[in-house]
């Protein structure tokens, strides 16, 4: 395997060898190293000197190889965007965010900047269930067979219905999407409604 | 630290081809430019020419016609061969390396070896 | 090819004299200028690079400026030990040329 080029080493194309770990540098026309994540350049390059790299101060930080004369500042979530942390800042790193629950993402730029209240969903509905947790508002969807929801609620999800006959009851009423099945001891008489009616 | 030695015959006769060698200890020879620089008596340091690791050569045109550089990387080696020589030939030959994958300046040099060129 | 034009090509000072070397250049470097200390037996040294950097290890009475075409060369007190012999060096263009070199002793 050929060795590697031992930066500055110029450049006739202002490409360089390793994009991910070198920069062209025009004014010299030469390629230099860029700085690893958690560093910043403390000396530009020449042709007879490589980048010279210091680390990042405490709460400051840069993510990915660079040739930043500067860190960037640590910010914190903001709690009145709606923001909470999940991770702290570190000098490789910035600080990892998430919408606080029961919010979603409602500005994105690069980042969420700015989370608002999920919507309710009515009686007989459900939050359709996301990847990721926070990504966007609700997006209700009617409980399936057998099942109820009977909040205005932007989380509650639906519940089957209640089987009469697991409990030694019998079914006084069908539940529907938005109510559960009423049960009964069978040796209650018939609601008023039904007396008079006599199955033989 | 990167050490550079250079050797060969101190004295060489007029017509004769010149042969130096200079050894790299301490570093590898690979990834850098390796240059040849002469002091004459009494005179400037003059820039011979230099050869890249890979094989890739420069020479000063004042010398090209006369001059040869090769590498032998498993050994750490490099050489200089300069033909035809004459009086005006004698001097301190110093073997010298670049600081980076770049043939601006001499970061590392050799103490030197003092040619003569003398029947 | 660039010619450099160094000067004084000799000159004799006292210790703790501040001593200056000037370079010229034939046409516009930048500041692609080595300076380097040649000692008798000795490895060449470099002094200065980019015109006007300190090399790593290089005690802070060397010093050097310009850029362009002219350039200068300044210890600011003279110790026993810098008695050799300074030459400039361009690396803006190939062929590599040296200035003719100061020899500086004591007096």
């Known amino acids: 395997s050929q060795p590697q080029a031992v930066p500055p080493y110029a450049s006739e194309n202002q490409t360089c060898r390793d994009q991910e770990k070198e920069y062209y540098e025009p004014q010299h026309r030469i390629c230099c190293s860029r700085c690893p994540p958690g560093t910043y350049v403390s000396a530009k390059c020449s042709r007879i000197r490589d980048t010279v790299c210091a680390t990042c101060a405490e709460n400051s930080y840069n993510e990915h190889w660079n040739y930043l004369t500067i860190c960037q500042l640590c910010r914190p979530c903001d709690p009145v965007m709606g923001l909470e942390e999940i991770a702290p800042c570190t000098s490789k790193r910035k600080t990892q965010c998430r919408c606080q629950p029961g919010m979603f993402c409602a500005a994105w730029a690069l980042e969420c900047t700015h989370c608002e209240l999920l919507s309710d969903c009515p009686p007989g509905t459900e939050a359709e269930l996301k990847d990721e947790v926070g990504k966007g508002n609700n997006h209700c969807v009617p409980c399936k067979a057998g099942h109820f929801q009977n909040t205005s609620s932007p989380s509650a999800r639906c519940q089957p219905h209640t089987r009469c006959e697991n409990q030694g009851l019998v079914e006084a009423a069908p539940g529907t999407a938005q109510s559960d099945t009423t049960c009964k001891n069978p040796l209650e008489p018939l609601p008023p409604e039904m007396s008079g009616t006599m199955l033989m | 630290q990167v050490q550079l030695q250079e050797s060969g015959p101190g004295l060489v006769k007029p017509s004769e081809t010149l042969s130096l060698t200079c050894t790299v200890s301490?570093?590898?020879?690979?990834?850098y430019y390796w240059s040849w620089i002469r002091l004459p008596p009494g005179k400037g340091l003059e820039w011979i020419?230099?050869?890249?690791?890979?094989?890739?050569?420069n020479y000063n045109p004042s010398l090209k016609s006369r001059v040869s550089m090769s590498v032998d990387t498993s050994k750490n080696q490099f050489s200089l061969k300069l033909s035809y020589v004459t009086a005006a030939d004698t001097a301190v030959y110093y073997c010298?390396?670049?600081?980076?994958?770049?043939?601006?300046?001499?970061?590392?040099w050799g103490q030197g070896t003092l040619v003569i060129v003398s029947s | 090819d660039i010619q450099m034009t160094q000067s004084p090509s000799s000159l004799s000072a006292s210790l703790g004299d501040r001593v200056t070397i000037t370079c010229q250049a034939s046409?516009?470097?930048?500041?692609?200028l080595i300076w380097y200390q040649l000692k008798p037996g000795k490895a060449p040294k470099v002094l200065i690079y980019?015109?006007?950097n300190l090399e790593t290890g290089v005690p802070s009475r060397f010093s050097g400026s310009g850029s362009g075409t002219d350039f200068t060369f300044t210890i600011s007190s003279l110790q026993p030990e810098d008695i050799a012999t300074y030459y400039c060096?361009?690396?803006?263009?190939?062929?590599?040329?040296f200035g003719q070199g100061t020899r500086l002793d004591i007096k």
């Open positions: 020419g230099y050869i890249y690791y890979g094989g890739s050569t």
């Open positions: 301490g570093g590898s020879i690979s990834s």
């Open positions: 060096q361009q690396y803006d263009h190939l062929p590599i040329t």
């Open positions: 980019d015109a006007s």
């Open positions: 046409q516009d470097i930048s500041n692609y």
């Open positions: 010298a390396r670049s600081y980076s994958s770049a043939w601006y300046g001499s970061a590392y």
